[in-house]
Interface confidence: medium
């Protein structure tokens, strides 16, 4: 009766479906209401529908599949999960969905899931089992390789009293589930700290995005075993300084490339060995560009063109001589 | 030729509930979606519900989301629409229609309509 | 939801004359891909018929006088020569997301 549009790739029908009469057996494969599908690109896209859960009725040769821009809240346990399994779901994307929850097993019965976006939603209760699926201490191999994790802070209003550093912290590190993990991204979601264990537990790191966040200091983080780490960006923190064990652990890595504009970078005694260190080292990208914000006297000095009597620090005066 | 035909309707009080049917025929009635949609005396249409072709997806209105339920029964090649605890504005002329496989092209056969009436 | 806001609400044609209908959604109802918008035709005493489906595709067996296009929130139902078959009520209808929701209807009637 509707002819399919030759169109595009992206259909919502198909050519075997176009007459009214059809001889075709039940489809298992249908394109769900309020999405698009393309068998060829194997993607479904379901964006900007307001949709508040996940369809039920995804077609079993889904690789991508975008969910982006609804309504969805809260991904339950099983979220995904089909009889037959969507056993080739390679991509999901989710974000941008009004999401506050995902609960402990949300991507479990995805055997072949390797990439997961979730930026861009409000989450206020991560399970810390959402991307393990389970709370024993060691789970089975997550397939996940690339986590982007933008955007996810909450208003602070709807924040639980806990750390939301530690209830990311915790879903990443849950049952070492994450060992295959290649691509995390946590840009954007206000950290004030970085726990100190989490990195050592995602050995397989090849790039990490703590963009855009307000980390102080680098202090108790340690680098070492992220051997295969090659992006670091930390633009857009609060870093005043780096010290010498994370310049000695960065220095140590071998395809490392860092990323450190728009730091408030503080030029005074302290900062001479990481000066010293710019000034050498190969790994910082755009390391021309970074410039000293405190103290006054040497605000958007570049760090490159400091020497050793540029970097005093005031004398502490005495209690005595203090003044109020 | 693709044919709906809705029944089911009659005169009821408010609160009491009734169950409208369509048979389907001339297509295979397992690969395709089917809405309900009504239109009240001398009003324009309003979309009432969708049932995918598995039964696996329901999407209703908020105005009936509660009391009324579709469902399917592809054996059959029927569609039913149970409604619980009417009221006087479902008073309205019921039509199945068939979204044609995949749901981007509208609705693109009809029933000719099932009259309710909701009255004391 | 999405309002589907129709003009004009009525409509008198000299037979053999051109008639446009709009309809304008509160917000898009179009992906990259394709446009969920579509028309139908109403007579008196009958159901709805599908005229026009993703905006501008011809149902199979409408007369070729009847056009659609648009994207976005703008569409148009165009009927190039009127005739008198045409009397009826015409609505458009979204289905972008749920609930579908229908124009108000735009009344056809002949001069």
């Known amino acids: 009766s509707s002819p399919t549009s030759s169109a595009s790739s992206f259909s919502s029908s198909a050519p075997f479906l176009a007459s009214a009469v059809s001889a075709q057996p039940p489809l298992p494969d249908q394109c769900p209401a309020l999405c698009e599908c393309s068998e060829a690109a194997r993607t479904v896209k379901c964006v900007n529908r307001n949709l508040t859960e996940v369809p039920t009725d995804l077609p079993a040769y889904v690789r991508n599949l975008f969910l982006t821009g609804n309504q969805l809240a809260v991904l339950p346990a099983g979220a995904f999960a089909r009889r037959p399994p969507l056993a080739e779901l390679a991509a999901l994307n989710l974000s941008g969905s009004r999401l506050d929850e995902v609960r402990a097993g949300a991507f479990e019965h995805l055997p072949s899931l390797r990439q997961l976006d979730l930026s861009h939603n409000p989450l206020a209760d991560l399970s810390p089992f959402a991307f393990s699926g389970s709370n024993a201490s060691v789970s089975a191999p997550s397939p996940l390789v690339e986590l982007i994790l933008n955007h996810i802070v909450p208003p602070e209003d709807e924040r639980q009293n806990r750390s939301f550093e530690g209830m990311v912290v915790a879903a990443l590190l849950a049952g070492r589930a994450l060992q295959g993990l290649r691509r995390l991204e946590l840009a954007s979601n206000h950290f004030l700290y970085l726990p100190r264990d989490v990195l050592a537990q995602l050995p397989s790191l090849r790039h990490l995005d703590l963009s855009n966040n307000s980390l102080v200091s680098l202090t108790y983080v340690s680098f070492r075993n992220l051997t295969h780490l090659e992006s670091l960006h930390l633009e857009d923190n609060a870093l005043k300084v780096l010290h010498n064990g994370t310049l000695a652990e960065l220095q140590g890595l071998p395809h490392i490339r860092v990323f450190l504009d728009n730091n408030p970078w503080v030029c005074d005694c302290h900062m001479a060995d990481m000066v010293t260190w710019l000034k050498e080292t190969e790994v910082v990208q755009g390391k021309d560009r970074l410039t000293c914000a405190y103290p006054e006297k040497m605000r958007n000095r570049v760090l490159l063109e400091l020497n050793s009597a540029d970097l005093d620090c005031d004398p502490i005066l005495p209690p005595s001589l203090q003044t109020s | 030729e693709v044919q709906l035909v809705e029944s089911g309707g009659g005169v009821v009080q408010p609160g009491r509930s009734l169950r409208l049917s369509c048979a389907a025929s001339g297509f295979t009635f397992s690969n395709f979606g089917m809405h309900w949609v009504r239109q009240a005396p001398g009003k324009g249409l309003e979309w009432v519900a969708y049932i995918s072709s598995g039964s696996s997806t329901f999407y209703y209105a908020d105005s009936v989301k509660g009391r009324f339920t579709i469902s399917r029964d592809n054996s059959k090649n029927t569609l039913y629409l149970q409604m619980n605890s009417l009221r006087a504005e479902d008073t309205a002329v019921y039509y199945c229609a068939r979204s044609p496989a995949y749901y981007r092209y509208g609705l693109d056969y009809w029933g000719q309509g099932t009259t309710v009436t909701v009255s004391s | 939801d999405i309002v589907m806001t129709q003009t004009p609400l009525s409509l008198s044609v000299t037979p053999g004359q051109p008639a446009s209908i709009s309809c304008r959604a509160s917000?898009?109802?179009?992906?990259?891909?394709?446009?969920?918008m579509h028309w139908y035709q109403q007579k008196p005493g009958q159901p709805p018929q599908l005229l026009i489906y993703?905006?501008?595709n011809l149902e199979s067996g409408v007369p070729d006088r009847f056009s659609g296009s648009g994207s976005g929130t703008d569409f148009t139902l165009k009927i190039s020569r009127v005739e008198a078959e045409d009397v009826g009520v015409y609505y458009c209808?979204?289905?972008?997301?749920?609930?579908?929701?229908f124009g108000g209807g735009t009344k056809v009637e002949i001069k």
């Open positions: 993703s905006s501008s």
């Open positions: 917000q898009s109802v179009s992906s990259s891909t394709f446009s969920y």
């Open positions: 209808q979204h289905s972008w997301e749920i609930p579908y929701t």
